[in-house]
Amino acid sequence: LTCLGGFASPGPVPPSTALRELIEELVNITQNQKAPLCNGSMVWSINLTAGMYCAALESLINVSGCSAIEKTQRMLSGFCPHKVSAGQFSSLHVRDTKIEVAQFVKDLLLHLKKLFREGQFN
């Protein structure tokens, strides 16, 4: 998590700040959504439990050419301890259904808000 300084501020970012910034970015995406997000692209849904940040990145990183989520992809990479590339799915990632990116972002946002309220920043 201390690697998050690269895009948000000059030094290491406290976990609470990093999570708040991710939440703010997802709020921006959902509020500024006029046309269907990423043209209706579909991604694998994830279990919002252990390994959630890497799983979310593994799903979203496959979407290319969608500028609206590029910042989210970068931010999620700061939460994931290992490098994630397109087409890579960990054993934590059960591929049982695909959903639209817009729904994925909404689900992730709701869960992150809950974590923030509960003080779970890692």
């Epitope: 043209n39 209706g40 692209s41 579909m42 496959n62």
Partner: nanobody, 116 residues
Framework: EVQLLESGGGLVQPGGSLRLSCAAS????????MDWVRQAPGKGLEWVSS????????YYADSVKGRFTISRDNSKNTLYLQMNSLRAEDTAVYYC?????????WGQGTLVTVSS
């Protein structure tokens, strides 16, 4: 330019079968995961099935598991969806999609109507 052309839809009775095809061009078909997505009248998009680039990995929505089979022929740049035991709730426009791309890269769809 990516082009996907679906065919094989039509009117079928409950319990019947149909085989949808999707001819792909404009990209290296064998390198990409592919999806079937459907949209029922007045409803949102619903993912149906996905297949990995080689065809060895297949995935299905619970609503079609055991009834639909996705396959591909990379030598013919064609994606298929074999639909058996069709139900009224399968009535929809079925789209072939290059995975992780928006509907700018989807086909025009083929209508499947299940009715007696």
């Amino acid at each position: 330019e990516v082009q996907l052309l679906e065919s094989g839809g039509g009117l079928v009775q409950p319990g019947g079968s149909l085989r949808l095809s999707c001819a792909a061009s404009g990209f290296t078909f064998r390198d990409y995961e592919m999806d079937w997505v459907r949209q029922a009248p007045g409803k949102g998009l619903e993912w149906v099935s996905s297949i990995g680039p080689s065809g060895s990995e297949t995935y299905y929505a619970d609503s079609v598991k055991g009834r639909f089979t996705i396959s591909r022929d990379n030598s013919k740049n064609t994606l298929y969806l074999q639909m058996n035991s069709l139900r009224a709730e399968d009535t929809a426009v079925y789209y072939c999609a290059k995975a992780y791309t928006g509907f700018g890269y989807w086909g025009q769809g083929t209508l499947v109507t299940v009715s007696s």
